[in-house]
Interface confidence: low
Amino acid sequence: SAPGEDEECGRVRDFVAKLANNTHQHVFDDLRGSVSLSWVGDSTGVILVLTTFHVPLVIMTFGQSKLYRSEDYGKNFKDITDLINNTFIRTEFGMAIGPENSGKVVLTAEVSGGSRGGRIFRSSDFAKNFVQTDLPFHPLTQMMYSPQNSDYLLALSTENGLWVSKNFGGKWEEIHKAVCLAKWGSDNTIFFTTYANGSCKADLGALELWRTSDLGKSFKTIGVKIYSFGLGGRFLFASVMADKDTTRRIHVSTDQGDTWSMAQLPSVGQEQFYSILAANDDMVFMHVDEPGDTGFGTIFTSDDRGIVYSKSLDRHLYTTTGGETDFTNVTSLRGVYITSVLSEDNSIQTMITFDQGGRWTHLRKPENSECDATAKNKNECSLHIHASYSISQKLNVPMAPLSEPNAVGIVIAHGSVGDAISVMVPDVYISDDGGYSWTKMLEGPHYYTILDSGGIIVAIEHSSRPINVIKFSTDEGQCWQTYTFTRDPIYFTGLASEPGARSMNISIWGFTESFLTSQWVSYTIDFKDILERNCEEKDYTIWLAHSTDPEDYEDGCILGYKEQFLRLRKSSVCQNGRDYVVTKQPSICLCSLEDFLCDFGYYRPENDSKCVEQPELKGHDLEFCLYGREEHLTTNGYRKIPGDKCQGGVNPVREVKDLKKKCTSNFLSPEKQNSKSN
């Protein structure tokens, strides 16, 4: 039988009455146009909703926008358009919400053609009040907050000027001209690229990378011949043009660009690209595109310096620069990532790694599913997950995979079961152990969200017809109840719940259509009365993550340690609560060769844990350029995986000696860098 229809599915008592008392409708006094929603702060209950409507006139388009505010998680909204002087707000800039709980909001207004600059509305009290500020420039990008200080803002102008404000947008100063891209780094540092000969596009590959650590008082050129740059974790990356041809290489710095090393990665040509798929303070996943428009490339994983890379996954699906990749960090379990590969026959298959890219494998077939028509052997197949690529191809996939750090082990995704991703209508699958095992959760495509740190899962069927039913589960998707939240069905446009999955409120957004007009409407449902009591100690059970063989002493060891979690029992219907903190008990493992990656000059043959010297480097001294100095490496081929905490056991030796010889790391050597002050 289908999930949720088993006899043993316990019914939640009197849920209809409990939910009906906690369902709040709000009809917006708006013609349907576009709507955008932003949460302001964490656990504040404040939501801002901006609706915009364009009326096409014969000569021009007349626009109208309205701003609404809720402070009770969307149960009630107040029209606050008058706080922004009924000004039309530019939706392409969105609502710039400040970091953490700063309560800051910036809205960018539409201004008339001949004006000297743009206009913004600023709030620093969670949108209770707004101040209008006229800008000395026309913004090209949304205002960017410094992660360290929400009073510091930067923006690029339509004239390619870099503008900075030190008092939350009250006063602005142009600190540099001819800027292509600017990003905040750590410690209020700004990194940006500049062009010399006319435009960003014309100078691509000849840009300079600059840094200012004092908001524009002084500058340092930290790189030349730059194609692009990116920040990931503690790493600063630059792709740099080669001297002789049109290829480029990645250089990496861990000291904000003072010194650079060339990453041991393949160079790429004009039509190729690099992409940082994921990065933390330990390491980086880097995608390197294949030559030609193959639609795939190779994933490499870095060492702790971002310099030495190991090939992690071949034929990784990534369509074009800025295109689609299915690469997904499963945030509900450490070390787990899911992505897609393009196989030789051009079919797309899903792969999963449980050890941060060390090994990739197919997803295990769900026990309650049959292999589909893509499977050669009807008894042997895998689960294949639909993600960004499927969505971009307009398959019937309304949502990407979902996982939350505080809903340990839970992963929800659309998928098909066979030898490859199928274009047939997908079903929804759930894993409760971080991707090791899967179960079909819902038939057909759905929108889904996680509430109360996994205590409740909510879903709505994806349909072209109007809907009025929501489904929910209190046991991690095993059993489902349905609730009719309105008598009159609405055209559904989206589910909204507070980021972080701690809330017990869900908002269903859509519009009603009548003969004369259509209006935005939201229904906010509070599940607090479904989960009547707070969870107690007896409601939790001990779970060992990454456990595959309980008989093995090293069972659960990933990246040198294992973790035991306290997890809510599926049978417990109770509130984790907003203050719920994941309880975990780590224990260190003995080191094995699996805890080491192959060092510079070494590689791992397939299905072997030993690192073997690259034939072309046999008998050669291993010397390489690091931070502009020549280094000599004495190694037996291993280097600890970044973030690996193992102790004892296997202990390969390595030593790096500074040869006290200068060498240039291509075009980013310190000698070529210069500083200047304003």
Partner: antibody, heavy 117, light 108 residues
């Protein structure tokens, strides 16, 4: 069965033009890159041009850029090589080859182009 | 551009011999290398791709090895039909995807 059949070769005077065709069958043409490779009499293989599966990207060695143009018609399962300003040193057998990425896995039987006055 | 140096340029061997042809590349091509066989008057035939993978239908006596800048095609036990010219070709980075100059394998 994968088949590639070249045509359009022949004798042409220096400075003249020629258009080679390659008819593909037995595989899904529009998902593969395709290449032309030539071989001068008694000499080795020389890569001439490559076109991506959708025809978006084309590649040539520097010495042939501007004179040779590779194109394809996916509706007709056909690959073409337009050769202009031909020289004596362009005399060769021209092969079309399927090019899935890391190799040229199927080749046609070749068509001879002779540039001579 | 990447330079390909194939050696030897010609080679005499007998049926049953073990034969090795090498291809040295001017920079690391990360195993992006193919080997082809061409018989007189015929079109080339793919033997090995990605340095070590045998193409469909190719006898197991043909094998490829190597990484970085040095690659090898080995014929473990030469058969009469193996006398031909062999070419390597790299597929690393952007074009040109150069061929080696060829190795002519003749009967001793």
């Amino acid at each position: 069965e994968v088949q590639l059949v070249e045509s359009g070769g022949g004798l042409v005077q220096p400075g003249g033009s020629l258009r080679l065709s390659c008819a593909a069958s037995g595989f899904t043409f529009n998902i593969y890159g395709m290449s032309w490779v030539r071989q001068a009499p008694g000499k080795g293989l020389e890569w001439v041009a490559t076109i991506s599966s959708g025809g978006i990207y084309t590649y040539y060695p520097d010495i042939l850029k501007g004179r040779f143009t590779i194109s394809r018609d996916n509706a007709k399962n056909s690959l073409y090589l337009q050769m202009n300003s031909l020289r004596a040193e362009d005399t060769a057998v021209y092969y079309c080859a399927r090019h899935p990425g890391g190799a040229m896995d199927y080749w046609g039987q070749g068509t001879l182009v002779t540039v001579s006055s | 551009d990447i330079q390909m140096t194939q050696s030897p340029s010609s080679l005499s061997a007998s049926v049953g011999d073990r034969v090795t042809i090498t291809c040295r590349v001017s920079e690391n091509i990360y195993s992006n290398l193919a080997w082809y066989q061409q018989k007189p008057g015929k079109s080339p035939k793919l033997l090995v791709y990605a340095a070590t993978n045998g193409a469909d239908g190719v006898p197991s006596r043909f094998s490829g090895s190597g990484s970085g800048t040095d690659y090898t095609l080995t014929i473990s036990s030469l058969q009469p039909e193996d006398f031909a010219t062999y070419y390597c070709q790299h597929f690393w980075g952007t074009p040109p995807w150069t061929f080696g100059q060829g190795t002519k394998l003749e009967i001793k």
